[in-house]
């Protein structure tokens, strides 16, 4: 009989294809329990049943069947805290980044039927249960409504709501995108007695208008109140209503701290501390001063009082307050003291304990690394994430500080769990952190596990992506390295994605992928199979991502370097990195490209127009081209105001249009969605106009009716295919 031919495993493996990426063939799963108590959670199964789990009794059963879900085409659900009702969400219709409208049905779990009579109107902009019982608050046509029980008629709390003018309980465009990062602006008190909400008045805000072509004979115009840099901003007011008898006193306005109210300001977040204590955070329009104000309900006055001695000021002298956002407080059990992340004297963001004043704050963590997020504070423990471990800024590990001990002791919960596979974690805690889930995002295959909150012992693997692991066995994946390079006194972390059969003695084309926005991070120890993975795997391109000045979690000196001068150091540092990569000896100097999206499109455009001759070609997708065209909250946070007596000069100097002449010697592909509500098509239109005026040849592609994400399946396929052709042509790679 013929002998078996031995085939080395390497030969049986295939490279990734663009189709793999576009089809999402190698996407991974995560498992986040929907906690409903200390030891119970819900989870939507693969077949769309909503399953109840009790960790301690090991009990599990279907609480809501997929047939019930299917009967109203539900794609999401929410259980009332008294467990009597479930809302079912269907007809999901995306609006902006977080916001969407939907139709909601209430299902009575006791009766096993939908609640009839006084059905909810449609479409609803936001809906949520009270934290206790089964009261419902919802926003419809920019007004807030309350139902004492699902079958009750609604009570209308606000009447001022008006499309594109006044928003109650939901943010307007700029607050949604740049301040709250949520679709809601209402918060129940822990006992469900009070409901706090924000009213956003956009009446005086200039409108951005753009065409939406659709299928009709005439395009329709989308109008959004959108304050660009220096423009009039929303006027915000915070109200709290007693939901027991909302019709009696009516909503009560919460006073704004005097030092904030004296000029333009923002509301930045609201945190309920206890049933009659609330914490509001405010920010001056010049975003270097933040005030945290603790307010109490005065039963005798029937009012919310915010004493001056309960105002805590956070100020930055080197840049803006906070990181991307100002951090939120994590209150202790005493409902007075709290833990908060802000910059220490060395400019590193760390956890501080505030008992009375910020000046007397006790620093809890310290070092040349940063605390990133406080997950939970319990009676005896504080759980947080940081990038301390082994000095890699792009890692995330979860730590526990035993605050009951004196001095507090620190333990890394995740550092040594699956060290090779897992270096980037997030966590989800049950009510008092009795149990928690860890979700590891890489660098290996993502894995989700369940843990005991006291011992940190792993109880169960919730999702380990076995199918993905099996399907990747026969794929030639590129090698990923995370390293640092030094230039002068600066250290830049980079991620390099190397083709599967990488040989240091050969020369490879290089593609820089850049984002580079303030307080962002691209060099992260996470797993991904995406377009750049394909470019390395199949097309033999070396990919590099570099975190230059202005990026996050490496201290304020590095972060605030870009303050008031966007578009300078971000670009400079990409150029420095490219020169260093060339020195490594395996980069073909004649075939270097750069690409980026959004802020990355801005940086890639400026890098291409740097006049260095380093880049042969590049792509900008949905780039900002002038900070005057972008949202006030974002632009002004980093650039100040575009006025003569502030920073107009740099606003003008930092535009892509100002460098139109310098595009003459590069191949430039400019791409934008025409219905981009975020970075308006105007940005690319102005770049194109400047290039035409300068008689510079370039390539362009627009995506009709696509927004900032260019997310529709067809558009995505076209986009990545188009960019691939462009790159392969630039690098002289055969099709």
């Amino acid at each position: 009989r013929p002998s078996r031919v031995y085939k080395p495993e390497g030969n049986t493996k295939r490279a990734l294809t663009l189709k793999d990426i576009l089809n999402g063939t190698f996407s991974y799963k995560t498992y986040f329990p929907n906690w409903i108590s200390e030891q119970e959670y819900l989870h939507q199964s693969e077949d769309d049943n909503i399953v109840f789990y009790n960790i301690e009794t090991r009990e599990s059963y279907i609480i809501l069947s997929n047939s019930t879900m299917k009967s109203v085409n539900a794609t999401d659900y929410g259980l009332s805290p008294d467990r009597q009702f479930v809302y079912l969400e269907s007809d999901y219709s995306k609006l902006w980044r977080y916001s969407y409208t939907a139709t909601y049905y209430i299902y009575d779990l006791q009766n096993g039927e939908f609640v009839r009579g006084y059905e909810l109107p449609r479409p609803i902009q936001y809906l949520c249960w009270s934290p206790v019982g089964s009261k419902l608050a919802y926003v419809y046509q920019n007004n807030i409504y309350l139902k004492q029980r699902p079958g009750d008629p609604p009570f209308q709390i606000t009447y001022t709501g008006r499309e594109n003018r006044i928003f109650n309980g939901i943010p307007d465009w700029v607050y949604e995108e740049e301040m709250l990062a949520t679709k809601y602006a209402l918060w129940w008190s822990p006992d469900g007695k009070f409901l706090a909400y924000v009213e956003f008045n956009d009446s005086d805000i200039p409108i951005i208008a753009y065409s939406y072509y659709g299928d009709g004979q005439y395009p329709r115009t989308i109008n959004i109140p959108y304050p660009k840099a220096g423009a009039k901003n929303p006027v915000v007011r915070v109200f709290i209503v007693d939901t027991t008898y909302p019709h009696h006193v009516g909503p009560m306005e919460v006073p704004v701290p005097e030092m904030i109210a004296s000029s333009d300001y923002y509301f930045s977040w609201l945190t309920w501390v206890s049933s009659e204590r609330v914490c509001l955070q405010w920010l001056k329009r010049v975003q270097n001063v933040s005030v945290l104000s603790i307010c109490d309900f005065r039963e005798d006055w029937h009012a919310w009082e915010c004493p001056k001695n309960q105002e805590h000021v956070e100020e930055s002298r080197t840049g803006w307050a906070g990181g991307f956002f100002v951090s939120t407080p994590a209150f202790s059990q005493d409902a007075t003291s709290y833990y908060k992340i802000f910059s220490d004297k060395d400019g590193y963001k760390h956890i501080h304990y505030i008992k009375d004043t910020v000046e007397n704050a006790i620093q809890i963590t310290s070092g040349k690394w940063e605390a990133i997020y406080i997950f939970r504070v319990t009676q005896d423990s504080l759980f947080y994430s940081s990038n301390e471990f082994e000095g890699y800024p792009g890692r995330r590990n979860i730590y526990r500080i035993s605050i009951g001990n004196s001095p507090p002791s620190k333990k890394c919960v995740t550092c040594h769990l699956r060290k090779e596979r897992c270096q980037y974690y997030t966590a989800s805690f049950s009510y008092k952190a009795k149990y928690y889930a860890l979700v590891c995002y890489g660098p290996g295959l993502p894995i989700s596990t369940l843990h005991d909150g006291r011992t940190d012992q792993e109880i169960q693997v919730l999702e380990e992506n076995k199918e993905l692991e099996n399907s990747l066995r026969n794929i030639q994946l590129p090698k990923v390295e995370i390293k640092k390079l030094k230039d002068g006194g600066l250290t830049f972390w980079y991620k390099m994605i190397l083709p599967p059969q990488f040989d240091r003695s050969k020369k490879y084309p290089l593609l820089i992928q850049v984002y580079g926005g303030p307080c962002s991070q691209s060099v992260k120890s996470v797993f991904a199979v995406n377009w750049i993975t394909y470019l390395a795997s199949k097309e033999g391109i070396v990919i590099a991502l570099v975190d230059g000045r202005g990026t996050a979690f490496q201290g304020d000196k590095f972060l605030h370097a870009v303050y008031r001068k966007l578009g300078v150091y971000e670009v400079e540092d990409q150029l420095t990195a490219v020169r260093k990569f060339i020195e490594m000896g395996f980069i073909d100097e004649e075939r270097i490209a750069i690409w980026g999206w959004s802020y990355g499109g801005y940086v890639s455009s400026l890098a291409l127009a740097s006049g260095t001759g380093l880049f042969k070609c590049g792509i900008a997708v949905a780039p900002v081209s002038s900070w005057e065209y972008y949202a006030s909250i974002y632009s002004e946070r980093f650039m100040g105001l575009p006025t003569k007596d502030d920073n107009l000069e740099h606003y003008k100097n930092s535009t892509v249009m100002a460098r139109a002449e310098y595009f003459r010697n590069v191949d430039y592909l400019l791409i934008h969605g025409t219905a981009d509500d975020n970075v308006h098509f105007q940005n690319s239109a102005q770049i194109a106009k400047a290039l035409v005026n300068a008689q510079v040849d370039f390539q362009a592609m627009w995506y009709s009716d696509q927004n900032h994400g260019i997310l529709s399946g067809r558009s995505q396929n076209h986009l990545y295919t188009h960019m691939t052709h462009f790159l392969k042509q630039c690098f002289s790679l055969s099709d």
């Epitope: 009570f155 209308q156 006055w301």
Partner: antibody
Framework: EVQLLESGGGLVQPGGSLRLSCAAS????????MSWVRQAPGKGLEWVSA???????YYADSVKGRFTISRDNSKNTLYLQMNSLRAEDTAVYYC??????????WGQGTLVTVSS | EIVLTQSPGTLSLSPGERATLSCRAS???????LAWYQQKPGQAPRLLII???TRATGIPDRFSGSGSGTDFTLTISRLEPEDFAVYYC?????????FGQGTKVEIK
């Protein structure tokens, strides 16, 4: 002790104007929604208007565009400016503590008579 | 607007007797928003019941409220001489808040 004291009522011709006042004491006026409720002679109660502590105003359809509710928190006083008065506006006008219900304190009322 | 219809229009009873007053709404009213008031001649109304069944501060326990949806009841278990007055139900569920036309409880 909570007290509400209305004033400003009287006889006025149709088309005329009148301004009612309600002086409040015994509670934190600036924190509460306040209403005007009227009662035509021998008839039932009719809600006229309300104002939140923060100043938002609400009106019954029958008076919208003619009546204006306002408040001066520094003076602990509620007002009702009544213009274009009609015979059917004749009533005792009460000021009451509350927005849309649970009116827990009432003034003694002031009589407005609209007649030629 | 929500119309509240009270019955009977007049109730003639003797002190010590039980009085049952009815209030029917033209559409459903959540219990939280239903109140009862008492008004004596030449006086301002006085709040008796909030949330359909909770007595307001200082109201004697002979007054009780019940009901839900569209049917609500005020009960005075044993009429005292000072209880003879006009009683109004009121809804605060929607704007405009409305009152019933009143039930007069008179001495028989």
């Amino acid at each position: 002790e909570v007290q509400l004291l209305e004033s400003g009522g009287g006889l006025v011709q149709p088309g005329g104007s009148l301004r009612l006042s309600c002086a409040a004491s015994g509670f934190t006026f600036s924190s509460h929604a306040m209403s005007w409720v009227r009662q035509a002679p021998g008839k039932g109660l009719e809600w006229v208007s309300a104002i939140w502590a923060s100043g938002e105003q609400y009106y019954a359809d029958s008076v919208k565009g003619r009546f204006t509710i306002s408040r001066d928190n520094s003076k602990n006083t509620l007002y009702l400016q009544m213009n274009s008065l009609r015979a059917e506006d004749t009533a005792v006008y009460y000021c009451a503590k509350g927005w849309l219900g649970n009116f827990d304190y009432w003034g003694q009322g002031t009589l407005v008579t609209v007649s030629s | 607007e929500i119309v509240l219809t009270q019955s009977p229009g007049t109730l003639s009873l003797s002190p010590g007797e039980r009085a049952t007053l009815s209030c029917r709404a033209s559409q459903s009213v959540s219990r939280s928003y239903l109140a009862w008031y008492q008004q004596k001649p030449g006086q301002a109304p006085r709040l008796l019941i909030i949330g359909a069944s909770t007595r307001a501060t200082g109201i004697p326990d002979r007054f009780s409220g019940s009901g839900s949806g569209t049917d609500f009841t005020l009960t005075i278990s044993r009429l005292e001489p000072e209880d003879f007055a006009v009683y109004y139900c009121q809804q605060g569920q929607v704007i405009p808040p409305t009152f019933g036309q009143g039930t007069k409880v008179e001495i028989k």
